[in-house]
Each structure stands twice: as structure tokens, then as C-alpha cells.
């Protein structure tokens, strides 16, 4: 009887593991405003919070400005990027802006970077208005392997809204790879 | 043998519960157009459908214009807000608009409100065009505790698109809190 | 003893099934740029990749330009649509554009189509700027039945960005219907 029970318990433990009682990975990273790059060119954003306010991470790693996958799976990835300018923040050098976000995946095995999602808009921010604002949201479902890295690039980083509710990105695992 | 089986069944029931065979909470709430506030100021939207058309709710509560969490967990929250204006609706008070959405969390234990997500755009809706439209989408992954309330605030509520496919917000539980 | 074990194993297998060890359906479809319709009218986009680059599908079917549900459930649906124009592509027929996306559900039992989500913006793409870009993102949580079909309609399809990171839609099952 004990042997039979052990066999059932083994199945049960195996099921427990396969049923994702193991914690599903996730991350929600918010912009670290103390270190936003300047300029109008496209840059990779490397400073994000992972453990304060709404920011959190579990079973993923944040290192060198990149979100590193620790567990193979299909993940839903998302990003929300807000740009803003007030006339007191300096005079805009151009009214024609390209406000963009690119969510990229880098594989360290094959050192190459690929854009998973992009979004944004060209905007005409005239000096006639004292305040300008624009937000981008992107999201999608992707297969990620352990060791792959997710990063976020934006144009015009000096216009980023530094609030934690404004500029963030994240991921959560939805299911295993068959 | 019966005792052994009872022990295994106990484990099985426990696993079933832990495996989230209990229904995972969700909500998809669509705007109730019969009660949209007027004006151009920022207001909390309190009238939403939860049981008609695409609107639905399970293991969450909708009360007093807020979506109430009944079960601790990590949830994916989202909102889609559409604004529109046709010249037949009369002239806009101003051509320079700030069209914004704020998804907020209120804790009744600590009576304070915090913005989880924001999005939107400043727009110039000139009289040269007879129709104007703009949509905002935000989404993110957040830890929510039982009793916490989610609400949606917008600027310029009188410009909201009242269609159920246009203006809605929702949530679904992804995983437990460890 | 064997009878007891069989009974427990039966429960275990049933649980395994109910615990979604069966693969959860998903799809991420990217635009097939070789067959984008022309014109500025609203059209259904029928050419999507399902098995190259970021595009993938599992336990759902892609047929005749529509994503077909094979398994009842609650799904998170999303779409990201990018529009762009460069002056080298020729002059725009009009500077006032309505750039829109509609994610629709069709039921073959009741041959009718309903819009689940819409988004977009009216835009003024003036000849003063050599490049224009705009992206829309929509997402929401919906109950889908086996046999129902999801499709995407857009205005101004000739302006679509053909990159796989730009124009895509998808779905993933989150939970069963009770």
C-alpha cells in the first residue's frame, strides 16, 4: 500500500510542478528618472526600478538595463511610454518630433538584437502651446528562452515622463513551451 | 486502504484548490453612456456596465463606480478610452485639448488613491475638420489585495465615445501572491 | 488496492486535464505585406503570417484571413497597428486622415459580425513633414466560443507599416468558461 501511495504521491508532486505551482515569472519595471539620457536620438533605456512603488520582479532578473528571462515560456510583454514637454522645461528646437518606442529581444547565444514590438507617432508640438503630452502602449505574446534579454529603446529620451505610472514595461509568463 | 485513499484525495483536493481550479477573477466593464459627466475637467467615471454585451465580471465586484478586488493576486489591468467629436455636436470650447486617462487604485484600509497607469495626448482639434477621434490604451501588471478598488478617471468626459468597443476597462488575475 | 489506485489515477488524470496541462491556445499573427489592400476605405485584413518570425499559433486555426477559436474560454485579445508615410511614396490624397483599427468577432452559427475593440485617431499629415508615423494598440478580455472567428479591419490599409514588429494581432487563453 505504501508503495502504491508513494507512486501516487510522485505523480501528484510531478503534477504540482507541471501545474505551475512553481511561481510564474513576471516583472513590472518603472523608469528611473535620475538617469534618463539626453538628446533626441534613439537610445536604450537602462535605468529602471524593480523594487519600489509599483515596480516588482519575480523569477526574472534585471541587470545592466535589461530584463533577463530565467525560465523558458510564452510571455505577454508590454510597455507604456509617456512623453511630455512644458514650456518651462526649455524651448523645443523642432516642432516635428518622432516619438517612438522599440521593445527588443537580445539573445546572448547568438549576439543579435531583434525588435519584437514598436509603436509611436510623429508629432507637431508647436511653441504656441505651453504643454504637450503623448503616450504609447504596445503589447504582444512572445516565446522567450532562458537567457534572452528584453530591453526598451526610445527616441527623444529627454522628453520622457518620469512618473512610475507613465513610463514602464513588463512581462508575465502565460504558459510553458510544449 | 480507505484511510490511504482519503489522504491522497485530501492532497488532490488541496492541489485542485492551489492549481486555481477555483475560478480566476476577471472583469471587463464597458462605458454606460447614459450617465457620462459633462465638462472638460478631470473626473472619475462611475457608470459602467458589467453584465451586458461584452461586459462581464466574475469573482470581482462592481460597486459605486469602482471595481473591487475580492481575491489577492497579481492582475493584468487594462483600459481603452476613445474620445470623439463631430461638428454637429457644436463647437469645441477650445481647440487645444488634453485627452487623458488615469487608472487608479484606492485602498480602503489606508484611504488614499494612487495612479497605477496613465496615458493620453494633447491634441489640436481644429475647426477645419468636421470629425475628430483619438484613442488611448494602457495596460500593466499589478499586485492587488482583497478590498482594493480600481477606478478610471478621464479628462474631457463629454468627448467620450459611448460605444462598448471603444471605452472600457478590465482586469484578470494571472497568478497568486507567493 | 489496484482498484483504489485506478480511482485515484482517474482523478489525477482528470485534474491534469482540468489544470490545463492541455496546451492553452494562443496566436500571434503578423502582417503579410505582400498582400496589403490599397485605398483609403475600411477593409478587413486577410493576409497574416502565423509561422514565421514572431508569428505563431497553437490550438487555434488561421483560415481565410480569420483567427478561428478551437477551444471555449476567456481570451485576452490584442492588436498593434502601425501606419506610416514617407514623401518618397508619393503625395497623400488628403492630409486629413482617419487611421483606425477594429477587432471583430464573427459567429458562424449566427452569421453576424460584432466589433469587440476599436482604436485610432484622426490625423493631419501635412506636406511640411517628409515622414509621418502613427501606431494604435488595443487589448481586452473576451469570452470566445469554439468556431467563432476574430478578424481585423483597418482604414487606409495602403499606409500600413509592413514590419512584423509593427502590425500584428493575437490572442491567448487565460481561463475556462465556468
Amino acid at each position: 500500500i505504501r508503495a502504491e501511495k508513494a507512486m501516487v504521491d510522485g505523480s501528484w508532486l510531478d503534477l504540482a510542478k507541471r501545474s505551475k505551482l512553481e511561481a510564474q515569472p513576471f516583472a513590472h519595471l518603472t523608469i528611473n528618472a535620475t538617469d534618463i539620457p539626453t538628446g533626441s536620438h534613439k537610445v536604450s533605456l537602462s535605468s529602471w526600478y524593480h523594487d519600489r512603488g509599483w515596480a516588482k520582479i519575480s523569477n526574472m532578473t534585471f541587470s545592466n538595463g535589461k530584463l533577463i528571462v530565467n525560465q523558458d515560456g510564452f510571455y505577454y510583454l508590454y510597455a507604456n511610454i509617456c512623453f511630455r514637454h512644458h514650456e518651462t522645461s526649455g524651448d523645443l528646437a523642432t516642432e516635428y518630433l518622432q516619438l517612438m518606442v522599440y521593445v527588443t529581444k537580445t539573445s546572448i547565444k547568438i549576439p543579435s538584437s531583434h525588435t519584437l514590438m514598436k509603436g509611436g507617432s510623429t508629432k507637431y508640438w508647436s511653441g504656441n502651446s505651453e504643454f504637450h503630452f503623448y503616450s504609447i502602449n504596445v503589447g504582444g505574446f512572445f516565446k522567450l528562452r532562458s537567457g534572452e534579454e528584453i530591453s526598451v529603446e526610445v527616441s527623444n529620451p529627454s522628453l520622457l515622463d518620469p512618473d512610475q505610472d507613465a513610463t514602464y514595461f513588463g512581462a508575465f509568463k502565460v504558459r510553458d513551451i510544449d | 486502504i480507505r484511510a490511504e485513499k482519503a489522504m491522497v484525495d485530501g492532497s488532490w483536493l488541496d492541489l485542485a484548490k492551489r492549481s486555481k481550479l477555483e475560478a480566476q477573477p476577471f472583469a471587463h466593464l464597458t462605458i454606460n453612456a447614459t450617465d457620462i459627466p459633462t465638462g472638460s475637467h478631470k473626473v472619475s467615471l462611475s457608470s459602467w456596465y458589467h453584465d451586458r454585451g461584452w461586459a462581464k465580471i466574475s469573482n470581482m465586484t462592481f460597486s459605486n463606480g469602482k471595481l473591487i478586488v475580492n481575491q489577492d493576486g497579481f492582475y493584468y489591468l487594462y483600459a481603452n478610452i476613445c474620445f470623439r467629436h463631430h461638428e454637429t455636436s457644436g463647437d469645441l470650447a477650445t481647440e487645444y485639448l488634453q485627452l487623458m486617462v488615469y487608472v487608479t487604485k484606492t485602498s480602503i484600509k489606508i484611504p488614499s488613491s494612487h495612479t497605477l497607469m496613465k496615458g493620453g495626448s494633447t491634441k489640436y482639434w481644429s475647426g477645419n475638420s468636421e470629425f475628430h477621434f483619438y484613442s488611448i490604451n494602457v495596460g500593466g501588471f499589478f499586485k492587488l489585495r482583497s478590498g482594493e478598488e480600481i477606478s478610471v478617471e478621464v479628462s474631457n468626459p463629454s468627448l467620450l465615445d459611448p460605444d462598448q468597443d471603444a471605452t472600457y476597462f478590465g482586469a484578470f488575475k494571472v497568478r497568486d501572491i507567493d | 488496492i489496484r482498484a483504489e489506485k485506478a480511482m485515484v489515477d482517474g482523478s489525477w488524470l482528470d485534474l491534469a486535464k482540468r489544470s490545463k496541462l492541455e496546451a492553452q491556445p494562443f496566436a500571434h499573427l503578423t502582417i503579410n505585406a505582400t498582400d496589403i489592400p490599397t485605398g483609403s476605405h475600411k477593409v478587413s485584413l486577410s493576409s497574416w503570417y502565423h509561422d514565421r518570425g514572431w508569428a505563431k499559433i497553437s490550438n487555434m486555426t488561421f483560415s481565410n484571413g480569420k483567427l478561428i477559436v478551437n477551444q471555449d474560454g476567456f481570451y485576452y485579445l490584442y492588436a498593434n497597428i502601425c501606419f506610416r508615410h514617407h514623401e518618397t511614396s508619393g503625395d497623400l490624397a488628403t492630409e486629413y486622415l482617419q487611421l483606425m483599427v477594429y477587432v471583430t468577432k464573427t459567429s458562424i452559427k449566427i452569421p453576424s459580425s460584432h466589433t469587440l475593440m476599436k482604436g485610432g485617431s484622426t490625423k493631419y499629415w501635412s506636406g511640411n513633414s517628409e515622414f509621418h508615423f502613427y501606431s494604435i494598440n488595443v487589448g481586452g478580455f473576451f469570452k470566445l466560443r469554439s468556431g467563432e472567428e476574430i478578424s481585423v479591419e483597418v482604414s487606409n490599409p495602403s499606409l500600413l507599416d509592413p514590419d512584423q514588429d509593427a502590425t500584428y494581432f493575437g490572442a491567448f487563453k487565460v481561463r475556462d468558461i465556468d
Epitope: I36, S40, G90, D91, L92, A93, G127 | - | -
Partner: antibody, heavy 122, light 108 residues
């Protein structure tokens, strides 16, 4: 090589008007914001006005707002400063300067022209 | 507007000595958006430093900038005869762009 050459300065009575020009060469003029900066005799530097590359947006110091107008003719690679209702305190060397074009907001000035002297006196 | 105060007003040093010039802002300068210029008599100003610490093209490495927030410094590690001039700081993180009143570095 980037070159900026101001002209149009001179002696003018209080309440009078003057139009300064700045001829630019050595760069794609229409792609860069431009500014005017002045320096009263023996004093420090003061930003006066700025304009975007397209000419669509203009900015002014409070001290000249409503009296001075900045403009540009991109077909002629020329920047202008129309100065009306001139006062004694507007007496200064007026420099035209190029924005670097590397930041989305107008930032530092590089290079500068050699300057043109405006004297407002009766 | 942001007021920039430079100190000292005049700095008397000999060639080969180290010069340290200070620029203090009335409020924090966003994004280290600060530049330094050199102006010699009868000439237009010349850009030395932008972004608080980045050297402009063609500027010798004896010129260096540092600081953030409200306190910024221009350092000339070893003064050369041609370095004696008036130096101005300028912020561009807030509108309007403003200059300090200048520091004169003269030969002792």
C-alpha cells in the same frame, strides 16, 4: 566650415527700429534652430530670442517680448531680428548663434557670429 | 527663471596653475543641462563644455566640467597663456536659457 555673419547694426534713436540679419553657411540651415544673444558693453551675455528650423515656433526673453520679432528665410539661409520700440537698455553687441541640433530642446550655442553693435541713443 | 551665480568674480593665477571656476544655480538644473563658454576681448564666445562635462569639438583636455543639480565646476588643469579670458556658464534645462555673470581669469 560653419560660418555666421551678422549685419544691420548701427545707431538708432529710442523708439526707433532696426533689422538685423545673419547670413549662414556651411550647414543645412533649415535643419537647425537659431538664436540671438546680446551683450551690453562691459556686461554679461543675455539670450534674446530663438526660432525653430522650420520657423514655426518662436521664443523671446521677457525683456523683448512684444517689441522684437525673430524670423528666418530658409531659401536664403538667413536669420533676422526685427527690433521695434528700441530702448537705451537694448544697446549691445548682438550675436547670432546656431543650436547644436543634438537635443530636442534648444540648448547651447555653437558656433557664434562675430556680432553686430546696436546703439540706442538720442 | 534660473539665476546662475558664478564665483569668484575674478581669479588671478599664473600660467601652469590650476583654475577652478564655480557656477551655482538658484534651482536644480534639469538633466545636467549646463554649458561653459570662453570669451576673449573683442571676440565672440566659444563653447567649451556642454552637458556639464562633455568637451566640445577641438577643446583641449585640460578643460573639464563636473557637477549636477545646483553646483557645477569648470576646471582648467594647467593654465596656458591663451586660456586667460572671461568664462560664462549657461543652463538650458529651463526656459528661458540663462547665463552666469561671468568669471574673469587674469594673469597674476
Amino acid at each position: 566650415e560653419v560660418q555666421l555673419l551678422e549685419s544691420g547694426g548701427g545707431l538708432v534713436q529710442p523708439g526707433g527700429s532696426l533689422r538685423l540679419s545673419c547670413a549662414a553657411s556651411g550647414f543645412t540651415f533649415s535643419s537647425y534652430a537659431m538664436s540671438w544673444v546680446r551683450q551690453a558693453p562691459g556686461k554679461g551675455l543675455e539670450w534674446v530670442s530663438g526660432i525653430t528650423g522650420s520657423g514655426g515656433s518662436t521664443y523671446y526673453a521677457d525683456s523683448v517680448k512684444g517689441r522684437f520679432t525673430i524670423s528666418r528665410d530658409n531659401s536664403k539661409n538667413t536669420l533676422y531680428l526685427q527690433m521695434n520700440s528700441l530702448r537705451a537698455e537694448d544697446t549691445a553687441v548682438y550675436y547670432c548663434a546656431k543650436d547644436p541640433g543634438t537635443t530636442v530642446i534648444m540648448s547651447w550655442f555653437d558656433p557664434w557670429g562675430q556680432g553686430t553693435l546696436v546703439t540706442v541713443s538720442s | 527663471e534660473i539665476v546662475l551665480t558664478q564665483s569668484p568674480g575674478t581669479l588671478s593665477l599664473s600660467p601652469g596653475e590650476r583654475a577652478t571656476l564655480s557656477c551655482r544655480a538658484s534651482q536644480s538644473v534639469r538633466g545636467r543641462y549646463l554649458a561653459w563658454y570662453q570669451q576673449k576681448p573683442g571676440q565672440a564666445p566659444r563653447l567649451l563644455i556642454y552637458g556639464a562635462s562633455s568637451r566640445a569639438t577641438g577643446i583641449p583636455d585640460r578643460f573639464s566640467g563636473s557637477g549636477s543639480g545646483t553646483d557645477f565646476t569648470l576646471t582648467i588643469s594647467r593654465l596656458e597663456p591663451e586660456d586667460f579670458a572671461v568664462f560664462y556658464c549657461q543652463q538650458y534645462g529651463s526656459s528661458p536659457r540663462t547665463f552666469g555673470q561671468g568669471t574673469k581669469v587674469e594673469i597674476k
